[in-house]
């Protein structure tokens, strides 16, 4: 069964910077990746980035840069411009559309006790689903 992993990490050098890392474990080719925050895509989440393996990548504030790290994993850098840190308690979800498997989504957040540079474990939360 395909699986999506999500890691959320605070940058050690800049406490206002976060990076979301997501990956797809499974056969098939990825046709699109969507990163949302505040909940899953289509279920209250707001899209922060859309990445297509060949057409390009797009991101919207507070996301700074979306990029492919490998053929099956992506990263999204976020810049927290506010005085408080809304990212700390936020859920980030990554949805991978792949052929022929369909869509798979998983969510993660920064662990409450995170030290800079530490990341959430790459374990999918129960929002893993196939469309």
């Amino acid at each position: 069964t395909p699986e999506v992993w999500v890691q959320v990490q605070m940058e050690a050098t800049e406490l206002s910077s976060f990076t979301v890392h997501c990956g797809f474990l499974g056969p098939g080719s990825i046709s699109l990746v969507t990163v949302s925050w505040g909940g899953p895509d289509g279920a209250g989440g707001t899209k922060l980035a859309v990445l297509h393996p060949e057409l390009g990548t797009r991101q919207w504030a507070p996301a700074r840069q979306a990029r492919w790290e490998t053929q099956s994993s992506i990263s999204l850098a976020l810049e927290d411009s506010g005085a408080s840190s809304p990212f700390a308690n936020t859920t980030f979800c990554c949805k991978f559309a792949s052929f022929p498997e369909g869509s798979w989504e998983s969510c993660g957040s920064l662990p409450p006790s995170s030290d800079p540079g530490l990341s959430a474990p790459p374990t999918p939360v129960p929002i893993l689903r196939a469309d």
Partner: antibody
Amino acid sequence: EVQLQQSGPEVVKPGASVKISCKASGNTFTDYFINWVKQRHGKSLEWIGDVNPDNGGTNYNQKFKGKATLTVDKSSGTAFMGLRSLTSEDSAVYYCATLFFDSWGQGTTLTVSS
Amino acid sequence: DIVMTQSPSSLNVSAGEKVTMSCKSSQSLLNSGNQKNYLAWYQQKPGQPPKLLIYGASTRESGVPDRFTGSGSGTDFTLTISSVQAEDLALYYCQNAHSSPYTFGGGTKLEIK
């Protein structure tokens, strides 16, 4: 497949503002992420910016900041582009296109003339 | 901004001929992570909006005839039409799909003798 239907031609006076629309129909999950592109007569294409329907987030080409304002009404699947302080340089065909430019509207011709 | 330079600016060929047009970018369009080039080609016929032909430098959009072939990597790209048809009369644009602003080339005008 996404279909994009743009509003009709506009003739406006210098200094005025205008708002053109782009209605999307079809149903894939990146339908309503919309780009706007300018094409002056006999010239190449210029990307103006894009808009995210989830939160109204925008990305602009620096060249068009202050000139164009991009908005979207997610409920109707309609994107809008406002253009202000119009001059003859703004006379062009304006296109909307889907997120990765794989579907385009038919274009809206804007003529700025006194 | 990434500058896209196309050549030649116009081509005048007979039906059945092979045509090659060039597009050069001022910065690499190769994504090192997935080894994909974010370069697209568009065809614009008179009075019509542009139509996506090729993306990822070499992948044909669905429904595009196989006489259209895209190639290249990094900063140098080519669009080839193996046997030009009368309906290929159009302007052809390349586009940087790598980074904002998503700049277009000046275009190559294809005319049929």
